[in-house]
């Protein structure tokens, strides 16, 4: 209620002879700060005195001097909260009732703690989980009911009196709830733990033993089983007897039932510790076990290998890999079942014995088409030789041997011909399902393997042909040597390197790309006249009259190729130059006379130049000069002269005669 | 340095003749790489080319189609002058009226372009 | 005989080139080569500036330059300068009656 103090520490505090103790402690004063404090043993309170009797331990006094006799009790509080105090050492007779004597200025109040003080350091206590399992990690703890700062000590786990080796936690606790010390230890405990001690000592802080506690570890786990075999090393022969026994080594709890197993499964009507077998085969080779169970679970024996040997069965063979691409490597096995392994084999290529083949493995690293056929074998133990088996076929696999291409026609072969070819070849596994014919051409295949080309072309020059069956083998190219007229005719101007001008010493020449056969002849023509028959067509003095419209032709024995039309044209400057008059050579004054200067030239008169009869030029630069309206004094001759890019040429002298108007005359 | 003075009336009333002179300096009329043309230039009709006269053996001369029939051109070689007269003129007519010459001989080679111009005379066609 | 075929207006800022063409038919321009070119200033008669398609009178800049492709005739002035500003007029012997034709003129601005 309102009217107490208000105090927190732990009930009871426990402690041995020359340790020490620690009391944690808090309170709340009724009104205002601590002003006396008086630590009792045993109070007892005097009626009559309205006082505490017993042993003062500690006294505080309003000046705050303490004895010097009371340094073995400290109060480590205050003067309104802290109430902690400290008795360092504590002896036997300090056991029993503490009393704290708190007096403010208005109020007064006693509050009590026990304390409990043994002789000797008393022993820790061990905690178990209720049950331990083999495997399973369980948490033992080891509590001391005490704590002291003044006084160190250390908790030590051991097994069967050995330290162990796991790492514990330890922990401690002084607050006004709990005093103690603990120490956690995580563990997995095998089968083997079971019925060993765990000891939690308690030790000061040089190591030395103070007390201790131990337990004994109950530890469930599956029956732990011995199996023995006779005989011993578990080979036998076939028609030989085996016995396997089982002995149970520890079991916790204790065992239930018996079974056994062969290669991971469970004997039918085999529930004792005794497994007897008669007469056995080579089927009850295998691996044994003996398998028996308690409430944890089930227990197994290592295994046991159980050998019964038997000379090697019929042997089959597989091969790595068929079918095989020649060049390839392959590898044979052969397969017997046999005990003990064979120790030597015989290999038939055939049904002929292969020299010098005696292992389980035969490799071949590059096949040849020889390789084929059918391999078998015969394995050998100690207990005698197998049989040979029905074997296995090996199918070598190459592309197309020896192709060639084969002309079919007779010889030579003209531009136009129709020709037939065949691809032929030795031997192909597999066969072969397809042709190739180099180069690509819209040909006809008439059958598997024959190539007709329709109208061949002069440029057919080589021809090759592959037969294919998983690969294509290709054949040397055929060369078909076409017979063909002259080739690409054209006119070809040797010389002069430039354009033509009249007198220039000219060639043209006749070319052709190609002809087969190399032997031709050539022939020249113009507007359809022959003008010789060598390679070139020469002009000493090339003249106006020389241009035209020219061909070459070369024959040889196939036939004969024209070239197209080469125009030769003959530069040369103006000729020819004349005057002409409109409307003629004699106009009446006042009228319009048109002078046109007429010339024969290539390139074509660019710039014309008009003279009078003084050989004064007139400002004209046309082909036609205008006079309008012309007068009697432009009567005389007039004379052109052209120019072109190769020169310039001048006409004779025209004569314009002007006459006077009826209109002048009558004036006159 | 060749010169060409123009001379001649501002205003000519319609159907009446247009007469300009070109008086020459430093150069003669009779030259004979010379020609001697008169132009026009009117914002309706732009720079147009009325025609030429020179002298070669003898006096020729060249008109332009549009004005051909109304044109004609004149000498005056004592005083070194030519004259333009243009008949029957409508306001059509009416621009800045120029004499030029044409040097037709560059060193050896042909040339034609109109490298002297007289000042231009302004003519109005207007009653 | 109709005119020569100029643009009515060019322009470009000082120191930069201007180009102006003058198109013809094979009769005038494309026939011979005597282009020529003319400057004028407002209030003033026509100055030559490039005779026969590309030469240079004597006194004219050689900022100013003439060429001739087909029946098109090109003046250039490069590094244009302010007093360049003006009227710019080309001119062709032709084959007709008419024996010249000129261009419609081109107004060079100076920006």
């Known amino acids: 209620d309102s009217s107490k103090w208000v105090f927190e520490h732990p009930e009871t505090l426990y402690a041995w002879e020359g340790a020490c103790v620690w009391i944690p402690c808090t309170y709340r004063a009724l009104d205002g700060d601590l002003e006396s404090f008086i630590l009792f043993h045993n109070p007892e309170y005097n009626k009559n005195t309205s006082k505490f009797d017993g042993t003062r331990l500690y006294e505080s006094t309003k000046d705050g001097k303490v004895p010097s006799e009371q340094k073995r009790v400290q109060f480590l509080g205050d003067k309104n909260k802290n109430c902690t105090l400290s008795i360092h050492p504590v002896h036997l007779n300090d056991s029993g009732q503490l009393g704290l004597r708190m007096e403010s200025k208005t109020e007064k109040w006693m509050e009590r703690i026990h304390l409990n003080v043994s002789e000797r350091p008393f022993p820790p206590h061990i905690q178990l989980p209720p049950e331990i399992q083999e495997s399973q990690e369980v948490t033992l703890t080891c509590l001391l009911n005490f704590s002291c700062y003044g006084y160190p000590i250390q908790l030590q786990w051991l097994l069967e009196g050995v330290p162990m080796r796991q790492a514990a936690v330890t922990s401690t606790s002084l607050t006004i709830k709990s005093v103690f010390t603990r120490s956690e230890l995580k563990f997995s405990p095998q089968w083997s733990h079971h019925g060993k001690i765990v000891t939690c000592q308690l030790q000061d802080a040089d190591g030395k033993f103070l007390s201790n506690d131990t337990v004994q570890l109950n530890v469930k786990h599956t029956p732990k089983l011995e199996i023995k075999v006779t005989p011993s090393d578990a080979i036998v022969r076939e028609g030989d007897s085996v016995t396997m026994t089982c002995e149970v080594s520890s079991s916790n709890p204790e065992y239930t039932t018996v079974s056994w197993l062969k290669d991971g499964t469970s004997l039918k009507k085999q529930n004792t510790f005794t497994l007897n077998l008669r007469e056995v085969t080579k089927d009850q080779s295998g691996k044994y076990c003996c398998q028996v169970s308690n409430d944890v679970g089930p227990g197994r024996s290592e295994e046991v290998f159980l050998q019964v040997q038997y000379a090697p069965e019929p042997s089959t063979v597989q091969i790595l890999h068929s079918p095989a691409v020649e060049g390839s490597q392959v590898e044979f096995l052969c397969m017997s079942l046999a005990n003990p392994l064979p120790t030597n084999y015989t290999w038939y290529h055939n049904g002929k014995e292969m020299q010098g083949r005696t292992e389980e493995k035969v490799h071949i690293p590059k096949i040849l088409p020889w390789h084929a056929g059918t391999y078998s074998c015969v394995a050998e133990n100690i207990l005698g030789t197998g049989q040979r088996g029905p074997g296995a076929e090996l199918d070598v696999q190459y592309p197309p041997k020896k192709v060639t291409t084969v002309i079919q026609n007779p010889m030579p072969i003209r531009e136009g011909d129709t020709v037939t070819l065949s691809c032929n070849y030795n031997s192909s596994n597999p066969s072969v399902t397809r042709y190739e014919w180099k180069p690509h051409g819209a040909w006809e295949e008439p059958s598997l393997g024959v190539l007709k080309i329709q109208n061949v072309g002069w440029d057919n020059t080589t021809i090759a042909c592959a037969a294919c069956n998983s690969w294509c083998s290709w054949a040397s190219p055929v060369a078909l040597n076409v017979q063909y007229a002259p080739r690409d005719v054209r006119v070809r101007k040797i010389k002069p390197l430039s354009e033509i001008h009249s007198g220039n010493s000219v060639s043209l020449q006749c070319d052709f790309s190609s002809s087969h056969p190399k032997e031709v002849q050539f022939f020249w023509e113009k507007n359809g006249r022959l003008l010789g028959k060598e390679s070139q067509l020469n002009f000493d003095s090339i003249s106006p009259e020389d241009a035209g419209s020219y061909s070459c032709w070369v024959n040889n024995s196939i036939g004969q190729t024209a070239s197209k039309a080469w125009t030769l044209e003959v530069l040369y400057a103006p000729r020819r130059l004349r005057v002409s008059m409109s409307p003629g050579d004699q106009v009446m004054e006042g009228k319009s006379a048109t002078l046109t200067c007429e010339s024969d030239a290539n390139p074509p008169v660019s710039h014309y130049t008009w003279f009078d009869w003084n050989n004064q030029s007139l400002p004209y630069h046309s082909q036609k000069l205008r006079l309008e309206p012309v007068k009697v004094q432009h009567s005389g001759a007039y004379w052109c002269q052209g120019t072109n890019s190769v020169g310039k040429g001048r006409s004779p002298l025209s004569t314009l005669t002007v006459y006077y108007s009826p209109e002048t005359i009558g004036r006159r | 340095e060749v010169q060409l003075q123009q001379s001649g009336p501002g205003l000519v009333k319609p159907s009446q003749t247009l007469s300009l002179t070109c008086a020459i300096s430093?150069?003669?009329?009779?030259?004979?790489?010379?020609?001697w043309n008169w132009i026009r230039q009117s914002p309706s009709r732009g720079l147009e080319w009325l025609g030429r006269?020179?002298?070669?053996?003898?006096?020729?001369?060249d008109y332009a189609s549009s004005v051909r029939g109304r044109v004609s051109i004149n000498v005056d070689t004592s005083k070194n002058q030519y004259s333009l007269q243009l008949n029957a003129v409508t306001p059509e007519d009416t621009g800045v009226y120029y004499c030029?010459?044409?040097?037709?001989?560059?060193?050896?080679?042909?040339?034609?372009?109109?490298?002297?111009w007289g000042q231009g005379t302004m003519v109005t066609v207007s009653s | 005989q109709s005119a020569l075929t100029q643009p009515a207006s060019a322009s470009g800022s000082p120191g930069q080139s201007v180009t102006i063409s003058c198109t013809g038919t094979?009769?005038?321009?494309?026939?011979?080569?005597?282009v020529s070119w003319y400057q004028q200033h407002p209030g003033k008669a026509p100055k030559l500036m490039i005779y026969?398609?590309?030469n240079r009178p004597s006194g004219v800049s050689n900022r100013f330059s003439g060429s001739k492709s087909g029946n098109t005739a090109s003046l250039t002035i490069s590094g244009l300068q302010a007093e360049d500003e003006a009227d710019y007029y080309c001119?062709?012997?032709?084959?007709?009656?008419?024996?010249?034709?000129f261009g419609t003129g081109t107004q060079l601005t100076v920006l």
């Open positions: 030029a010459r044409v040097r037709l001989q560059d060193g050896n080679s042909w040339s034609d372009a109109f490298d002297v």
């Open positions: 430093g150069d003669s009329m009779l030259s004979n790489s010379d020609t």
């Open positions: 006269t020179y002298h070669r053996s003898t006096w020729y001369d």
């Open positions: 094979s009769s005038d321009v494309g026939g011979y080569n005597y």
């Open positions: 026969d398609v590309s």
């Open positions: 001119s062709s012997y032709t084959s007709s009656s008419t024996l010249y034709v």
